[in-house]
Interface confidence: low
């Protein structure tokens, strides 16, 4: 029959070429001479010329070695024609299967694989997976079936079988306990992939296993005992740097130190922070230390890590003896700001108050006093006793120096230490009002018509405080009452001035006496311009010849 079974041809054949594979045969050759030909990829289309057919005999020929990894199967068509070119058979399918030879080694997908595993993990923990491929056939043969193995391990500590690799998946796992990053931070495994399921060609790659840090080492103080000297009163003063060593990975949470003052800081005077680079504990004063109260502190500091320990580890403790050094401290006014009530206008030489300072130092130091700032120059201070006396007139109504009835003075105390130190205090004199100002009208110049005149309302002001102010009383003097009247309104804070008789156009003096609730009297001359006009006027109309 005009049929050919699939033909199997091994790749990489040695020849000689052309090599006869199979013979095409049509039973029509009994009747006529038959010519044979083949078509298809590998014959008359790319890759052309791999196969040919002997035109007359029908022998199918292979012209060159085949490569299964390039083309694994060829599908050709056989044709049979008579001498006159007429087709005598239907085109016949010819399948040529290229059988595999183990001509490709396995290839790892990377030259170097990288993985990591935590130190101290249990055997069986998976680390990483490596992969190798082989272009040969792995379905019908073992040529492309890859088996993995570990050829060598560097270093061989704690022994040479720390890892295993799954023969078929390439998964690398821990096989032994004892992974310790502090001893071996990285292993280099030479891994092999062998085809023929382990019996064939081998290729190698490197698997680098990084051992990740676990917090299995406690930080340790070195040294454990410290002595430090600190001047009293210093805040934020660096007392001591505490040094620790930690075998875990530098700059990791398992290495970074956390310090805690466990004891000896009852007054909460100290604080400890971690230096970000050196990992040292920096002990500083949170508050000033007081030599007079306590001249030595013994602190106990414990160190741990930012990360918790993965197993129970003993913690390291350091002892720091802090010696407080005496410092000549400044005298302190008691209270720092003193409020004293004093009547304004007291006589010169009159005592105002005594304002003294205390020296925190234990020795009985002599303190001397002086006034540092006295804007109006109203006061003096005895250098020995701190007695403040008036040397000028204290005036509550002096707006340049007095604000809200308070006159502020700064005083200074100086001890006789070496070197001497000074402290300042603030003396706030609250000036008590005295009825030393009479009422004053505003404005003091008026313009008024001599016909149907408008009443002139004048505001009354008094620099003193109540009760030395309203209600006010008004009185006209020096015959001013012949032409004018003056009346204080019901509220008692304005005076109404009225023209009661005709005056010719001119300028007149009106003598107005105002007295306050404390009968303090003040005479004021009001300058009144009288105009020839009716009712309300601002200025006199027409030519004005008045003086």
């Amino acid at each position: 029959d005009w049929v050919v079974a699939p033909i199997s041809v091994p790749e990489n054949g040695k020849g000689p070429f052309p090599q006869r594979l199979n013979q095409l045969k049509s039973n029509k050759d009994r009747d006529t001479k038959i010519f044979y030909s083949i078509t298809g990829p590998g014959a008359d289309s790319p890759p052309e010329g791999v196969f040919a057919v002997e035109k007359e005999t029908g022998w199918l020929l292979l012209n060159k070695p085949l490569d299964r990894e390039e083309i694994a199967k060829y599908e050709l068509y056989g044709h049979a024609v008579s001498e006159n070119g007429a087709s005598v058979e239907e085109p016949m399918n010819i399948s040529i299967i290229v059988t595999d030879q183990n001509d490709n080694k396995p290839k790892f997908t990377q030259d170097t694989f990288r993985g990591s595993v935590l130190e101290g993990v249990l055997p069986g923990t998976s680390v990483m997976q490596v992969t190798a491929t082989d272009e040969d056939d792995a379905i019908y043969t073992y040529n492309g079936v890859v088996a993995y193995s570990i050829h060598s391990q560097e270093p061989k500590d704690p022994h040479d079988l720390m890892f295993t690799i799954h023969r078929s998946t390439g998964t690398i796992s821990v096989i032994s306990s004892g992974l310790d990053r502090e001893k071996v931070p990285e292993y280099t495994l030479t891994i092999q992939a062998t085809d023929m399921d382990g019996d064939g060609s081998t290729t190698t790659a490197v698997a680098v296993v990084e051992i990740l840090d676990a917090n299995d080492n406690a930080p340790m103080f070195d040294p454990q005992k410290y002595e430090a000297h600190v001047p009293e009163n210093a805040v934020g003063h660096e007392v001591q740097r505490l040094t620790v060593t930690d075998l875990d990975a530098p700059n990791s949470p398992a290495w970074r130190a956390t310090y805690l003052i466990m004891g000896g800081d009852d007054g909460d005077h100290f604080t400890i922070t971690t230096h970000p680079e050196s990992n040292q504990g920096i002990l500083t004063t949170r508050k000033g230390l007081d030599f007079e109260a306590k001249n030595q502190h013994t602190l106990y500091v414990e160190v741990t890590n930012e990360a918790p320990f993965v197993l129970k580890l003993p913690t390291s403790t350091a002892t720091i003896v802090v010696h407080v050094e005496d410092v000549n401290e400044a005298p302190v006014f008691v209270p720092p700001s003193k409020v004293v009530e004093v009547q304004e206008g007291i006589p010169t030489g009159e005592p105002v108050c005594v304002y003294t300072a205390e020296d925190p130092d234990k020795e009985n130091q002599k303190i001397s006093y002086r006034i540092l700032r006295d804007p109006a120059g109203w006061l003096a201070m005895d250098p020995d006793s701190g007695q403040v006396t008036a040397v000028g007139t204290l005036d509550r109504e002096d707006e340049q120096f007095v604000r809200n009835n308070i006159y502020e003075v700064m005083v200074l105390a100086m001890d006789n230490g070496s070197p001497p130190t000074t402290g300042t205090g603030t003396l706030l004199l609250t000036l008590i009002d005295v009825n030393d100002h009479g009422p004053v009208p505003e404005p003091r110049q008026i313009t008024i018509c001599n016909q149907s005149p408008v009443r002139q309302v004048l505001n009354i002001t008094d620099k003193d405080l109540s009760p030395h102010t309203s209600p006010f009383q008004a009185q006209l003097t020096d015959d001013s009452d012949i032409y004018w009247t003056a009346e204080v309104n019901e509220e008692g804070d304005t005076v109404v001035l009225s023209l009661k008789k005709f005056l010719k156009q001119d300028t007149y003096d009106v003598h107005l006496s105002l007295s306050d609730h404390g009968n303090k009297e003040q005479l004021t001359v009001i300058r009144a311009t009288v105009c020839d006009c009716h009712g309300h006027v601002e200025t006199c109309p027409g030519p004005w010849k008045g003086g």
């Epitope: 990489n12 990894e69 183990n102 001509d103 490709n104 080694k105 290839k107 030259d111 170097t112 272009e135 050829h151 060598s152 560097e154 280099t188 030479t190 092999q192 060609s201 081998t202 290729t203 190698t204 490197v206």
Partner: antibody
């Protein structure tokens, strides 16, 4: 007996190319790497690169990328190295050498006799 | 790139003496080092691979040692045929590099 036979000496002009060959016999050519090594007169050895004839995979020393091209013909068990844009610096003896797999990594166990290339106008 | 440094560059010795060549790698190459002998006008011959394994047919007076970055080749009781140049080469991962060589001459 494993043998690695190299082609004869070449005299070439500057700027030209040359292709030298290395024929292997007595072992599985397809499944062993073939390496190429350069030796200038009176100097040491320089590794150029290698090829795996089974699938044509190549690895080069960066210094020779673009200068050397490695190929192999499985059917004739022959490895080739083409050197291009030749200058006097390329005048040297070129060796091919088989790299055998010892189950770990590789050393060069069979060497060709060397091909002398002289670049001169 | 891995650098291989060989010392000394040249050495004079007499037949019967013992000589040692050293080779230093710029980084850890574990045991992946080979030694080759080359005589004038000839191709190199493999002596030692994997730092200490003698190649087939190499006399037992040759011995290799070392790992990591420091390696040495020792020849006991020098024979006349031992004179020539000796090269180390790492065979860890490409690119493979050779040392500059040591020339062994008759004193």
């Amino acid at each position: 007996v494993q043998l690695v036979e190299q082609s004869g000496a070449e005299l070439v002009k500057p700027g030209a190319s040359v292709k030298i060959s290395c024929k292997a016999s007595g072992y599985a050519f397809s499944t062993s790497w073939m390496n190429w090594v350069k030796q200038r007169p009176g100097k040491g050895l320089e590794w150029i690169g290698r090829i795996y004839p089974g699938d044509g995979e190549t690895k080069y020393n960066g210094k020779f990328k673009g200068k050397a091209t490695l190929t192999a013909d499985k059917s004739s068990s022959t490895a080739y190295m083409q050197l291009s844009s030749l200058t006097s610096e390329d005048s040297a003896v070129y060796f091919c050498a088989r790299q055998r797999d010892y189950g770990a990594l590789y050393a060069l166990d069979y060497w060709g006799q060397g091909t002398r290339v002289t670049v001169s106008s | 790139e891995l650098m291989m440094t060989q010392t000394p560059a040249s050495l004079s010795a007499s037949v019967g003496e013992t000589v040692t060549f050293t080779c230093r790698a710029s980084e850890n190459i574990y045991s992946y080092l080979a030694w080759y002998q080359q005589k004038q006008g000839k191709s190199p011959q493999l002596l030692v691979y994997n730092a200490k394994t003698l190649a087939e047919g190499v006399p037992s007076r040759f011995s290799g040692s070392g790992s990591g970055t420091q390696f040495s080749l020792k020849i006991n009781s020098l024979q006349p045929e031992d004179f020539g140049s000796y090269y180390c080469q790492h065979h860890y991962v490409p690119p493979y590099t050779f040392g500059g060589g040591t020339k062994l001459e008759i004193k």
